[in-house]
Interface confidence: low
Amino acid sequence: VCSRDFTPPTVKILQSSCDGGGHFPPTIQLLCLVSGYTPGTINITWLEDGQVMDVDLSTASTTQEGELASTQSELTLSQKHWLSDRTYTCQVTYQGHTFEDSTKKCADSNPRGVSAYLSRPSPFDLFIRKSPTITCLVVDLAPSKGTVNLTWSRASGKPVNHSTRKEEKQRNGTLTVTSTLPVGTRDWIEGETYQCRVTHPHLPRALMRSTTKTSGPRAAPEVYAFATPEWPGSRDKRTLACLIQNFMPEDISVQWLHNEVQLPDARHSTTQPRKTKGSGFFVFSRLEVTRAEWEQKDEFICRAVHEAASPSQTVQRAVSVNPGK
Amino acid sequence: VCSRDFTPPTVKILQSSCDGGGHFPPTIQLLCLVSGYTPGTINITWLEDGQVMDVDLSTASTTQEGELASTQSELTLSQKHWLSDRTYTCQVTYQGHTFEDSTKKCADSNPRGVSAYLSRPSPFDLFIRKSPTITCLVVDLAPSKGTVNLTWSRASGKPVNHSTRKEEKQRNGTLTVTSTLPVGTRDWIEGETYQCRVTHPHLPRALMRSTTKTSGPRAAPEVYAFATPEWPGSRDKRTLACLIQNFMPEDISVQWLHNEVQLPDARHSTTQPRKTKGSGFFVFSRLEVTRAEWEQKDEFICRAVHEAASPSQTVQRAVSVNPGK
């Protein structure tokens, strides 16, 4: 709370406007108006997404109207920075107190249409963990007071399990909502169909998505694993590559193991399934390993989990960084 | 033309900004700054879509700095009015002349239902064929009688070449429109910016996309090529894999050669660039080859074309199906 012997400033950001056609100018000026305070030392700092900006500010000299002073500080931004949805804050320090105002590009008033997607369980969850889940994903929602409802049903009419819901605000200002439903392993394998219904006051009609076990021919994956040779300037790390191909259907889980321990998924990067020239699918998986790891045990395993693989729905291939040693 | 005996005013509209979440305030203030004129009578009028507004303007008293005067006039609008896409003009009459500035709500940077993308030239077209092109792609258009217009310009103001246009109806009923523009190799390398403007009767406003050479650090790709061993039941074909990694920027072209002849792009499948754990990117490329090919000449080349590769922007690696023979 400010003490009574000074009048604190009002901080307000104004911005240069778009032209008569609604087009953004090449540069955007933010003008921080610090007004109506008892004359005294003030310090103005600009922040970008909470970080102090190292900028050459064009701060106008302070003007005085009667007993109160005003100062303004201008920040010039490129159109690219402004359109990248960063938040800019004008932070004023005065008499040991901080006053601020923040701004960012106004959210689109007419955002892109809503899309809904319904996933199948991952083969890993289905066959290894034996606790399959399916996820209904709704993207590009405009944040609003209206609630998004995601409700589940089964084609058989049998009751569904309890689902868990998650909402996430994206950087672009839209809302992403997911609902994850545990499904019975046997129900799924026997071909049950699950439906996700999405309703929202701004949707003209409900969105319905359904998912079931993929039909059609089955083929087990072939798994090949390779290690890259040493490359100049990177003696202490190597890349391992795994090619998994000619499998059907396209649902597959890829894991890497070292020392009989499964490495975290974040360690590797696996491509989305793509069609081969024939009727199957393929993926690549890439893992970076360190000298410490291969010196501890020079055997890394690439494992594919797929419904057509036997035994026990897995196929794996071992690879070494230095196979000759 | 103004006579010499007075300095005319500069007219500029500033507006109140959206908050740190990008939300519009309940009311929007437009501030018309009329500055730097020789003191004299001025008249300020606000127009809405060209019509004089009957408003009670809060026009601040004129201030004088040295020999020049400044005046400001503020217009307060409801959020609804501002969001209805009307154009507001601050019109200043002074010494028998009219000076004005106009503004409206900034166009949505990504209007609903339609997305526009503007590609950079492929390194192959840029460095090998030396006939680079850029493509403006508009997707998710609702088919209608109204024409989608894609027009090109350059930041330098120089004329653009003749573009070619293609329309394609998608399975989901939407329309995809592309416009391909040949660009000068030297212009591109020297950093010219190209703009594609998309207009359509059903778009609330024009979409603008721009492209230019990627800035930032450069790193040449590492290229590794592998052949899969024989797999039961497929004696007469093999898969070749190429891992290209740690390159920057992400623009890359991948080719396969056999017998010193480049194989058609349709023969191989190459993933989109993905980030490595470090600062670079990686891709995988997959090629299926037949016994007839490897018996004719058992050497296949995976070639990467990338701006940081030297010499001549290419790095390649040879691989054989039967390396020992």
């Epitope: 007419n110 405009a142 701004h202 003209p204 | 609903r112 239902g113 009688k145 059903h202 609330p204």
Partner: antibody
Framework: EVQLVESGGGLVQPGGSLRLSCAVS?????????WEWIRQAPGKGLEWVAS???????NYNPSVKGRITISRDDSKNTFYLQMNSLRAEDTAVYYC??????????????WGQGTLVTVSS | DIQLTQSPSSLSASVGDRVTITCRAS??????????MNWYQQKPGKAPKLLIE???YLRSGVPSRFSGSGSGTDFTLTISSLQPEDFATYYC?????????FGQGTKVEIK
């Protein structure tokens, strides 16, 4: 330019049946758009009746569902409205129309000249 | 179903007059900033003709004296300066939700 021409209207007794045709020229009904029937009782307003999408899917106004069937003959580039169990309140001018699609919504952009159906004993 | 109520049901006006017709929906016909309200003109013995789509977008070939505005549940069709060929019946229509519905019509007659 697309043109729509209705035919098949006339006088029919209550409980009777009638099939209206809409012949389309200048555009294939399987290429795109939604194709509509809309009616207008004498001196009254407009009422949307039924539609057939270029992909063959159909929609009906709940007020007529069960008595009315929309269909098409691709080889003749014609779509139809089969009306059964006709009542006096079905008396109207029946228009066929082509709807323009916009992200799951449609409006009636091109209309035929209309054909009069009178249900009376 | 969404009910649309037009007012007035009829009006008499002279050439050059400014005419305003309103249409009120029983629920909002807006979706993500798009207004799913259309306006049609019908002359005696003729099929309706689409004038305005999405609340305010003039169909090509429609004179600029016609304009549409509004959002949510309240929409307006305005003829800025009535011409002899504008005497007709005007209908609003919502395409936000199936079944698509029309207003009961507003007849614009010569005074």
């Amino acid at each position: 330019e697309v043109q729509l021409v209705e035919s098949g209207g006339g006088l029919v007794q209550p409980g009777g049946s009638l099939r209206l045709s809409c012949a389309v020229s200048g555009y294939s009904i399987t290429s795109g758009h939604r194709w509509e029937w809309i009616r207008q009782a004498p001196g009254k307003g407009l009422e949307w009746v039924a539609s057939i999408h270029y992909d063959g899917s159909t929609n009906y106004n709940p007020s007529v569902k069960g008595r009315i069937t929309i269909s098409r003959d691709d080889s003749k580039n014609t779509f139809y409205l089969q009306m059964n169990s006709l009542r006096a309140e079905d008396t109207a001018v029946y228009y066929c129309a082509r709807a323009t699609h916009y992200f799951g919504h449609h409006h009636f952009a091109v209309w035929g000249q209309g054909t009069l159906v009178t249900v009376s004993s | 179903d969404i009910q649309l109520t037009q007012s007035p049901s009829s009006l008499s006006a002279s050439v050059g007059d400014r005419v305003t017709i309103t249409c009120r929906a029983s629920q909002s016909v807006d979706y993500h900033g798009d207004h799913y309200m259309n306006w049609y003109q019908q002359k005696p013995g003729k099929a309706p003709k689409l004038l305005i789509e999405w609340g305010s977008y003039l169909r090509s070939g429609v004179p600029s004296r016609f304009s549409g505005s509004g959002s949510g549940t309240d929409f307006t069709l305005t003829i800025s300066s009535l011409q002899p060929e504008d005497f007709a019946t005007y209908y609003c229509q919502q395409n936000a939700e199936d079944p698509y519905t029309f207003g009961q019509g507003t007849k614009v007659e010569i005074k």
